[in-house]
Amino acid sequence: EPPTACREKQYLINSQCCSLCQPGQKLVSDCTEFTETECLPCGESEFLDTWNRETHCHQHKYCDPNLGLRVQQKGTSETDTICTCEEGWHCTSEACESCVLHRSCSPGFGVKQIATGVSDTICEPCPVGFFSNVSSAFEKCHPWTSCETKDLVVQQAGTNKTDVVCGPQDRLRHHHHHH
């Protein structure tokens, strides 16, 4: 009765358990009772990343600059090329097949997390006491100016989009306050 299973680094062919080819090599010929599996290294710009019985190596991924892509890590005979996006852009998927511009946070919103090559900007609404008056992919919400520390008073209240406006203290009220 021929074998129905093989060990993990083997494959079943013609009632034989043949050795798989190591990562970085492709199958040229199956083993026989008297000859070992024959494997050959992948060519330039090709790879195989597992123990395998593939007769063709895979082509390295091309990081197309027209899609905003650049090489993050050059491929080897055992690994694929890893692409990332140009500065200011991020990948549209985990496979990073194309890029989109980082999103900006509108006025009233600040950057919670700056975008990376693989994740977009994360914005958050500016809470009470903070504001953002610009559309930006980098600016956080800024705290309102503290008029008191400048010995000024609030002349106009702040919003999530505007800072408070400080002005001088009322001299008369100030005078009465001290007498």
């Epitope: 074998p3 050795s19 083993c31 070992e36």
Partner: antibody, heavy 127, light 107 residues
Framework: EVQLLESGGGLVRPGGSLRLSCAAS????????MNWVRQAPGKGLEWVSY????????DYADSVKGRFTVSRDNSKNLLYLQMNSLRAEDTAVYYC????????????????????WGQGTMVTVSS | DIQLTQSPSSLTASVGDRVTITCRSS??????LAWYQQKPGKPPKLLIY???SLEGGVPSRFSGSGSGTDFTLTISSLQPEDFATYYC?????????FGQGTKLEIK
Amino acid sequence: EVQLLESGGGLVRPGGSLRLSCAASGFTFGSYEMNWVRQAPGKGLEWVSYISSSGETTDYADSVKGRFTVSRDNSKNLLYLQMNSLRAEDTAVYYCARDVFFFDSSGPPGAYGMDVWGQGTMVTVSS
Amino acid sequence: DIQLTQSPSSLTASVGDRVTITCRSSQGIRSSLAWYQQKPGKPPKLLIYGASSLEGGVPSRFSGSGSGTDFTLTISSLQPEDFATYYCQQLNSFPSTFGQGTKLEIK
């Protein structure tokens, strides 16, 4: 230290059942294929069963097929051999053994061997 | 199933002797063969894998050769600790099988 320790052996009546365990330590158990090998008193070695690292693939000697089941719990570093419908001829010392794949990237395809063995547990099937 | 036949079944030799044990397979197994040493009351110990590769820590007086169907284990100069039983095993395909063993005794 890399170690395998079998337990669960003992005296059992013909037709009875027994579950052997093999506790692994000192290595990443879940990365290795494992085997059970037995040795009847005064006799040679007999391969009994094989299990892949994930437990997905198993194989058995014809003499135990349909009666013995090999399994593993990688979270507990344990290998098992469930033995049912035991016969007198199953009397033996049972060893668990680690399969290792030796590989030299510059050489020919790699080779297997059983590089770590437990001390064995005795199973006696007798009425 | 693949049968392995070891010869001789037993062998008497002296310290310093060169000893050869053979293992013949019923079908070609390329170099998918291992050799083990076993002493009474102990588990087997791996000596050779892939027909000719020496396991780490095994003395260089042990060597293996062969491919296909015919294999040999050679001990170039027997030491007192080498008196034991030796087994070949094919790991080419399931079911894995062992030779019947060669008992090496002191003269």
